[in-house]
């Protein structure tokens, strides 16, 4: 269920779920958002403070790079 | 060097438990997050469950929720997974493996054998 | 989840020869990763990053491809290449593996 996570239980759980793609401490700007002014949501407010499950915690993800070769 | 080493494993009846170990050296277990991997007799590598280094953030495949349990104890620099409700489909190699950002599932041990049948 | 899918299921090659491996995602990744397992031993990471070789690799092994579909190739199959090998996927949640790929000599 839904559980708090801060430090380095975040971190582990980013890099977990967020694997390759990496992930942000704060959404990418206008994320999730129409509003210039609206205050910028970080993880630690939203999982550190309050409980987070693991769909919120995947907001987080970084988007995927894009498709280049290697 | 990095060494895990699964015991516990054995033949179980249906709907029986079974608790698995890891026991980790070689790394400062405590700073790490790890995660068991399965792989049924000739088949392919199933992820099965994730525990965060200090042990309060836990995940699970959809199949094993509600019946697995991982936990650790960093005292012991010890990984276990509490397996009840076995089901014949959880027959499998268990191992325990761990991860550096990027070398994703770098670590592995020799695995423990789990047999459920009747 | 992402369903990876690779090709073909088994492979015979001879000694010295190309061996080529082939890994679809169902869906777009960043990246592919590759392990190899033979008989009685666990996976062993050969490639990280799609194309990075693993501590002590032979530079025989070679990765590439971007998106949806990886290769891994063996450019000069030797007799300890024998073994599965597996291509997985860690840009979306949960992690996944291909089903596996049998190397055998021919």
């Known amino acids: 269920g839904p559980e708090t996570l801060c430090g380095a239980e975040l971190v582990d759980a980013l890099q977990f779920v967020c694997g390759d793609r990496g992930f942000y401490f704060n959404k990418p700007t206008g994320y999730g958002s129409s509003s210039r002014r609206a205050p910028q949501t970080g993880i630690v407010d939203e999982c550190c403070f309050r409980s987070c499950d693991l769909r919120r915690l995947e907001m987080y993800c970084a988007p995927l790079k894009p498709a280049k070769s290697a | 060097e990095v060494q895990l080493v699964e015991s516990g494993g054995g033949v179980v009846q249906p709907g029986r438990s079974l608790r698995l170990s890891c026991a980790a050296s070689?790394?400062?277990?405590?700073?790490?997050?790890m995660t068991w991997v399965r792989q049924a007799p000739g088949k392919g590598l199933e992820w099965v469950a994730y525990?965060?280094?200090?042990?309060?953030?836990?995940y699970y495949r959809d199949s094993v929720k509600g019946r697995f349990t991982i936990s650790r104890d960093n005292s012991k620099n010890t990984l276990y997974l509490q397996m009840n409700s076995l089901r014949a489909e959880d027959t499998a190699v268990y191992y325990c493996?761990?991860?550096?950002?990027?070398?994703?599932?770098?670590?592995w041990g020799q695995g423990t054998l789990v047999t459920v049948s009747s | 989840d992402i369903v990876m899918t690779q090709s073909p299921d088994s492979l015979a090659v001879s000694l010295g020869e190309r061996a080529t491996i082939n890994c679809r995602a169902s869906?777009?990744?960043?990246?592919m990763h590759w392990y190899q397992q033979k008989p009685g031993q666990p996976p062993k990471l050969l490639i990280y990053?799609?194309?990075k070789l693993a501590s002590g690799v032979p530079d025989r092994f070679s990765g590439s491809g971007s998106g949806t579909d990886f290769t891994l190739t063996i450019s000069s199959l030797q007799a300890e290449d024998v073994a599965v090998y597996y291509c997985?996927?860690?840009?979306?949640?949960?992690?996944?593996f291909g089903q596996g790929t049998k190397v055998e000599i021919k």
């Open positions: 525990i965060s280094s200090g042990g309060g953030s836990t």
């Open positions: 997985l996927q860690r840009s979306s949640y949960p992690p996944t």
């Open positions: 990053g799609t194309s």
């Open positions: 869906s777009s990744v960043s990246y």
């Open positions: 070689g790394f400062t277990f405590s700073n790490y997050y």
């Open positions: 493996t761990t991860e550096d950002y990027g070398y994703w599932f770098a670590y």
